[in-house]
C-alpha cells in the first residue's frame, strides 16, 4: 500500500500542475462528480439547486468549494503518507457534520484522476496514474479507519 519515494515524486509533480490553477481544477472535479454521481449533490445544500452543467460552471460557490477541497487534499499529499494530523480533523468533520460516506470519497478520487488525465496527459502516464491512485487509496483508507473510530459507518 505504501508509495515509494519515486511515486510520491510523480504525485507531487502532477500536483504542481494542479496548483497552477486550483479553482479551475476544483471546479472541473466537482462538476464531474455531480454529473457522474448526482446523489452526491444531496450532501451540498449550497449546490442542490444547480441542475445543468452551465449552472455549475457559473457558480462561484462551487468553484470556491472545489478550491477548498483540492487545497486540503494537496496539504495531505504533501505529507507523503505521514498525514495523521491532517486526516483527523478532516475525518471528524466529514463523519459527524457532513456525513460523507467512503464511497463518495472513491467517486471524487475517480474524478480527480479523470481531470488529471484530460488536463495533463503529458505528465500523467501509467506510472503517475498508478502513483496517484495509490496515494488517494491511502488517503481513503486512513479516512475510513478514522470514521470507524468515530463510529461512523461510512
Amino acid at each position: 500500500m505504501g508509495l515509494s519515494d519515486g511515486e510520491w515524486q510523480l504525485v507531487l509533480n502532477v500536483w504542481g500542475k494542479v496548483e497552477a490553477d486550483i479553482p479551475g481544477h476544483g471546479q472541473e472535479v466537482l462538476i464531474r462528480l455531480f454529473k457522474g454521481h448526482p446523489e452526491t449533490l444531496e450532501k451540498f445544500d449550497k449546490f442542490k439547486h444547480l441542475k445543468s452543467e452551465d449552472e455549475m460552471k457559473a457558480s462561484e460557490d462551487l468553484k470556491k468549494h472545489g478550491a477548498t477541497v483540492l487545497t486540503a487534499l494537496g496539504g495531505i499529499l504533501k505529507k507523503k503518507g505521514h498525514h495523521e494530523a491532517e486526516i483527523k480533523p478532516l475525518a471528524q468533520s466529514h463523519a459527524t457534520k457532513h456525513k460523507i460516506p467512503v464511497k463518495y470519497l472513491e467517486f471524487i478520487s475517480e474524478c480527480i484522476i479523470q481531470v488529471l488525465q484530460s488536463k495533463h496527459p503529458g505528465d500523467f502516464g501509467a506510472d503517475a496514474q498508478g502513483a496517484m491512485n495509490k496515494a488517494l487509496e491511502l488517503f481513503r483508507k486512513d479516512m475510513a479507519s478514522n470514521y470507524k473510530e468515530l463510529g461512523f459507518q461510512g
Epitope: 508509495l3 519515486g6 511515486e7 496514474q129
Partner: antibody
Framework: QVQLQQSGDDLVKPGASVKLSCKAS????????INWIKQRPGQGLEWIGR????????YYNEMFKGKATLTVDTSSSTAYIQLSSLSSEDSAVYFC??????????WGQGTSVTVSS | DIQMNQSPSSLSASLGDTITITCHAS??????LSWYLQKPGNITKLLIY???NLHTGVPSRFSGSGSGTGFTLTISSLQPEDIATYYC?????????FGGGTKLEIK
Amino acid sequence: QVQLQQSGDDLVKPGASVKLSCKASGYTFTSYWINWIKQRPGQGLEWIGRIAPEGDSTYYNEMFKGKATLTVDTSSSTAYIQLSSLSSEDSAVYFCAREVRNAMDYWGQGTSVTVSS
Amino acid sequence: DIQMNQSPSSLSASLGDTITITCHASQNIHVWLSWYLQKPGNITKLLIYEASNLHTGVPSRFSGSGSGTGFTLTISSLQPEDIATYYCQQGQRYPLTFGGGTKLEIK
C-alpha cells in the same frame, strides 16, 4: 554500461513453482523500476507487472495476480519473479526490463521456462 | 485494457528501402508510446520512447511519429541488421500493453 543478467533456463513440473532472477549492474538499482514481461513461443509480449526496488511498491497485470510474485533484494541488486502452480500455459520466455517513464530502456536476455512432466 | 493494433504483421522489403509500421491504440494514449525491436536470440531493444524520441545509441534512420491513437515507426535506408520483429507498447494506462508485432524480412 547497464546490464540485466537473468538466470538460466528452467524445466519444471506441472503444479510446481519457479523463481527467476534478474541481476542489475551499471546503474543505481534503486532508482529505476523493474518490469517483467512474458513471451510464449512464437507469440507477442505480455506485461506481467513492475516493482520499485527502493520501496517494494508493485503493480500487477490483473491476469497475473496470484500467478506471479515480484520481489527484490537491494543488497545484491537483484529482482525476482516467482511463478506458482505452473501449467503448460506458463511455458514461455520471461524477460526483466528496466523502466524509465513507462518505456523499457534495457532488457535482460530472457529466461525460458518449460513446464512438462 | 488498451488494445494496441499493429500492422502489418509481416513485411518484406529490400535493402535501402524506407518502411513504415503503424500502431493504433483503442483509446487516446497521447504520446505514451514506445517502439522496440526483438532479434533472434531474444535480444530486445528500445528504439523510440514517448512516440518520437530516439533512445540513446539508436541510429537516426529510425524515427517515430504520432499522438493520440495513431503512431508510426519509419525505418529509412533499410540495413541487414534491421531484420527483426518490431513491437509498439502503450504507457498511458495499466496494464501496459504491446502490439502484436511486425516481422520484417529482407527480400
